[in-house]
């Protein structure tokens, strides 16, 4: 029987260039008569052009919604009603070809062609893109607040903020023909719910979305986005009503940056340089293609690529890479943003070198990618350490902490977190190594204590990169390194001449001179510790709520003992910078550390002194008694303490704590407490110091109060941020 043909709406969006007209500022104002008259003519021309081709039978509707430079560019959309079976045949490319063909056929024609009555359309300037009904609806919702801006070469244009009476606005941006636009977004408020979407075309086409950002992101206070060419659209959707613009937008045209390089690496290990996407740290642009060719000096070496918060993963061939596609020696890998470091190790089997390609497969992009490159020894990729195959990183082996996600760094250990005697593989505790007393059968624990040794898990690395065997040699009053660097930066960790944490006791003035009280509007919120003349360390989760993210809110008190009164030794500071660890993850509490830069340096006194920071190799032995201090609640759910409390806690092996907390304890965490509970940190102690006293009498920062189940509960320990796990970031920031 007869069956009606199913028709579907196919939406197209595009632009065309008119050579015999010029753009004027009047055409940016939709309410102007010039705009109305021009759109009426342009719309007529567009309809006539489409209906002059075999697409005419499918024509449904069209609209010219905007104009731009070039001499005059018209931006439009149109809808064709086409039979479903022909849908794939009428791709944007086919439609564009048909319209261009039509334009070319009439270029030299003397016959009267309706669509050429007023406009001379450039066939080469026609662009047709795929769109959807949803895209047109999104576009129409912004037309009440539509801004067109042309930005010339060498210009940086600050865009006018949105119209707060509108619920959505669109900035249509255009630059010189062969350049690409770079948009800079800076969030200016601590919290908002505004949404901004950037597109690689003139309108909000979902398939050409570059990125969308939402709600005054603290992770990215400044975002720079690159378009693939000279056109871009930014759509704003209103969040909470605000009197002030929560962001500043500026745009500038930039030249295309080549992303191709040939490099020959030197005959040395470690990082030798950096490769990055154009205009890093800007988001890479759609259609980015980078090709890096690296030549390795010898087949003894492999090539290592060290990424920051980005990893490479295998992907099924039919699935596109949404965060960048990589091809390395014909292997296809997909990029993936993660909150961890990662390394890709590429074995070298031929002297021809290695070609690395990076491509943005889809229009959706992300933060620029930067990678450090260097060589590693193929026969011994991680001298003195363990190569974690899961993430390509070298991690300490047999130190009692499963640094590798599969835990293989702690498997097959003869001596875990202890020293292995040469004579008989007896294990002795690390503090007994190089302590002047032989504990191994033939005294191998006391050998090579005055000379350099190969670097390993517990060796201390001196500034000259040589290593010493003695564990924890920092600031013990005896130079162990040839360059004396183990005794540098030692003006720390000494208590002042001093005469409630759950189960604690009141501290005296000067007893914990590094202790900080972080306050908002006169209320103690978190603890912290002074680690340098202008830096206080605390927990990142103290700033979890958007309302707590602004530096202006916080006051830091040092030398304080009592919350309700001041004494002469007490000093206060404003905060000039607040830095959360870039890998901090709220849900898992991983990398729970933040640094506060004080508005002026501290003047050291008996009541105000920094605590010592441990080296990455510093070993805090499980079972060691350490101390936590703070003004937190004296019982679970109770109010904060008026007096600074102190309590001793015992360091717990990672394995035991991990079991208790169902394997939620990461290598950046450390546990302390007792099976019987009672002594523990509590609400208000967060970010405060867990300190351990070295044999020298100096106090080293082992942890920061982070999380735990309740306070002082039996069988549950306190979980602390492990300082040795985040020390490289701390040093990088502070120095």
């Amino acid at each position: 029987g007869y069956k009606a043909e199913v028709m579907v709406s196919q939406v197209y969006s595009g632009s065309l260039r008119v050579l015999n007209r010029h753009f004027s500022q009047d055409l940016t104002r939709r309410e102007s008569s010039a705009f109305r008259s021009e759109t009426a003519k342009a719309q007529k021309m567009l309809k006539e052009l489409i209906t002059s081709t075999r697409l005419g039978t499918y024509y449904n509707s069209s609209s010219v919604y905007s104009f731009g430079e070039g001499p005059l560019t018209c931006f439009f959309w149109f809808i064709l009603q086409i039979p479903e079976h022909r849908r794939l045949m009428l791709s944007p490319e086919v439609v564009q070809a048909l319209l261009v063909e039509e334009l070319l056929s009439t270029v030299n024609s003397s016959a009267a062609v309706p669509y050429r009555a007023e406009y001379e359309v450039d066939p080469e300037g026609l662009v047709i893109l795929e769109a959807s009904v949803k895209d047109i609806a999104a576009l129409n919702s912004t037309l009440g607040c539509y801004r067109y801006s042309y930005v010339g070469q060498g210009q940086v244009l600050r865009l006018k903020g949105p119209d707060h009476l509108a619920s959505s606005c669109l900035w249509h941006l255009q630059g010189p023909k062969d350049l690409m636009l770079k948009l800079r977004l800076e969030w200016t408020l601590a919290e908002c719910r505004d949404r901004l979407a950037m597109y690689d075309v003139a309108g909000p086409l979902e398939k050409r979305l570059i990125t969308s950002v939402y709600g005054c992101s603290r992770q990215e206070p400044v975002v720079e986005v690159l378009a693939s060419g000279a056109i871009m659209a930014v759509v704003w959707k209103k969040g909470l009503h605000s009197y002030y613009d929560p962001f500043v937008l500026s745009v500038q045209p930039v030249v295309f940056q080549a992303c191709e390089v040939n490099l020959t690496l030197d005959n040395r290990l470690d990082s030798q340089g950096v490769l990055s996407t154009p205009y890093f740290p800007s988001y890479y642009s759609p259609q980015t293609h980078c090709s890096w060719h690296l030549t390795v000096p010898s087949l003894d070496y492999g090539l290592a690529l060290w990424f920051d918060a980005y990893a490479l993963r295998r992907q099924k061939y039919d699935l596109p890479c949404t965060q960048g596609q990589w091809t390395i020696q014909n292997r296809r890998l997909c990029g993936l943003r993660i909150l961890q470091p990662y390394a890709e190790r590429i074995p070298v089997v031929a002297t021809a070198g290695i070609t690395i390609n990076f491509t943005s497969q889809i229009s959706l992009t992300g933060p620029g990618v930067r990678v450090h490159y260097g060589l590693y020894n193929q026969s011994d990729p991680c001298p003195g350490e363990f190569l974690c195959s899961v993430n390509g990183l070298c991690v300490p082996a047999c130190d009692g902490v499963k640094d590798c996600p599969n835990g293989l760094d702690e498997r097959n250990c003869v001596c875990r977190a202890t020293f292995q005697c040469k004579e008989d593989s007896t294990c002795i505790s690390l503090p007994k190594v190089c302590d002047g007393q032989p504990d191994c059968l033939n005294g191998s624990d006391e050998e090579q204590c005055q000379e350099g040794v190969p670097c390993g898990t517990f060796t201390f690395q001196c500034e000259d990169r040589s290593c010493v065997k003695k564990p924890n040699p920092q600031c013990d009053g005896r130079p162990d390194c040839r360059d004396g660097s183990d005794e540098e930066h030692c003006d720390c960790g000494l208590q002042g001449p001093s005469s409630r944490i759950v189960g604690g006791a009141v501290s005296s003035e000067g007893e914990w001179p590094w202790q900080a009280s972080l306050q908002v509007r006169g209320r103690h919120i978190c603890g912290g510790a002074l680690i340098a003349d202008r830096w206080v360390i605390t927990a990142a989760h103290c700033f979890q709520e958007d309302s707590m993210a602004s530096t202006v809110l916080w006051t830091v008190f040092l030398g304080k003992v009592w919350q309700n009164s001041r004494w002469p030794g007490e000093v206060s500071f404003k905060v000039s910078r607040l830095l959360l660890h870039p890998y901090h993850e709220e849900d898992s509490h991983d990398y729970d550390v933040a640094l506060l830069q004080l508005d002026h340096p501290v003047v050291r006194s008996a009541a105000v002194r920094p605590v010592c920071l441990p080296a990455r190799s510093h070993f805090f032995e499980p079972g060691l008694h350490c101390w936590i201090t703070g003004w937190g609640a004296l019982r679970e759910g109770g109010p904060i303490s008026n007096a600074l409390q102190k309590v001793d806690v015992q360091l717990i092996p990672q394995d035991l704590c991990s079991e208790v907390y169902r394997y939620q304890v990461t290598p950046r965490m450390l546990c302390a407490g007792y099976r019987k509970g009672k002594k523990d940190a509590c609400q208000g102690d967060s970010g405060g110091p867990l300190v351990c006293k070295a044999l020298s009498g100096r106090w080293f920062l082992a942890g920061l109060v982070s999380w735990g189940l309740g306070c002082g509960r039996p069988n549950y320990f306190g979980v602390y941020t492990r300082i040795t796990g985040v020390i490289s970031w701390i040093q990088q920031v502070v120095t």
Epitope: G400, C415, R416, A417, T418, C427, I428, S429, P622, G623, L624, H625, D648, Q650, I652, P653, D655, L656, Y674, R675, K676
Partner: antibody, heavy 123, light 107 residues
């Protein structure tokens, strides 16, 4: 019920060796540190040595008076701690007690002790 | 080594009496102090740890206090089963050291 039973004591000549055993039951032996103490006739208690559990490295510590002569070891598979005593002197005559350390309650806090085994060093 | 001085070395008391034993450390040991009860031929028994924490199952008539170098152990109402020798022990560092003991007998 937690129980510790010492065995292996007896009379031994000076300069000779003796091995004491301490068998634990009623608890997961491998989770606990083990220690030996002694009490010489008419004297107070004296700590001798200590061995940590595996999670704490299984390392050992000794009182200066026995270091180099005594060795503490453990076999978690059969829940036994040993004290190997070499080069014995008359000063080592005492009742030897083994005890359990629940390190998670506190380092060097010994919550259960055995009844003791007598070691007499005499020619 | 840390020396622990316990006093008195012996005392006689009647049932229901309250008795106090003191223990002094030769250096600051914060609160790292244990009190044990020891009866002849029996295993020593842990009573108090961390200077003042009562071990599970120990009657509340036993109590401890102090911090730093001076510590006190009290039995508030002596019972027949309390006649024994009591020892303090520091666990601030190795070697672990004991007080000389206090023998409590019936008056």
């Amino acid at each position: 019920e937690v129980q510790l039973v010492e065995s292996g004591g007896g009379l031994v000549k000076p300069g000779r060796s003796l091995r004491l055993s301490c068998t634990g039951s009623g608890f997961t032996f491998g989770d606990f540190g083990m220690s030996w103490f002694r009490q010489a006739p008419g004297k107070g208690l004296e700590w001798v040595c200590f061995i940590r559990s595996k999670p704490y490295g299984g390392t050992t510590d000794y009182a200066p008076s026995v270091k180099g002569r005594f060795t503490i070891s453990r076999d978690d598979s059969i829940s036994i701690a040993y004290l190997q005593m070499n080069s014995l002197t008359t000063e080592d005559t005492a009742v030897y007690y083994c005890s359990r350390n629940d390190i998670l309650t506190g380092y060097y806090i010994f919550d259960y002790w055995g009844q003791g085994t007598q070691v007499t060093v005499s020619s | 080594d840390i020396q622990m001085t316990q006093s008195p070395s012996s005392l006689s008391a009647s049932l229901g009496d309250s008795i106090t034993i003191t223990c002094q450390a030769s250096q600051d040991i914060t609160n790292y102090l244990i009190w044990y009860q020891h009866k002849p031929g029996k295993a020593p028994k842990l009573l108090i740890f961390d200077a003042s924490n009562l071990e599970t199952g120990v009657p509340s008539r036993f109590s401890g206090s102090g911090s730093g170098t001076d510590f006190t152990f009290t039995i508030s109402s002596l019972q027949p089963e309390d006649y024994a020798t009591y020892y303090c022990q520091q666990y601030y560092n190795l070697p672990l050291t004991f007080g000389g003991g206090t023998k409590v007998d019936i008056k």
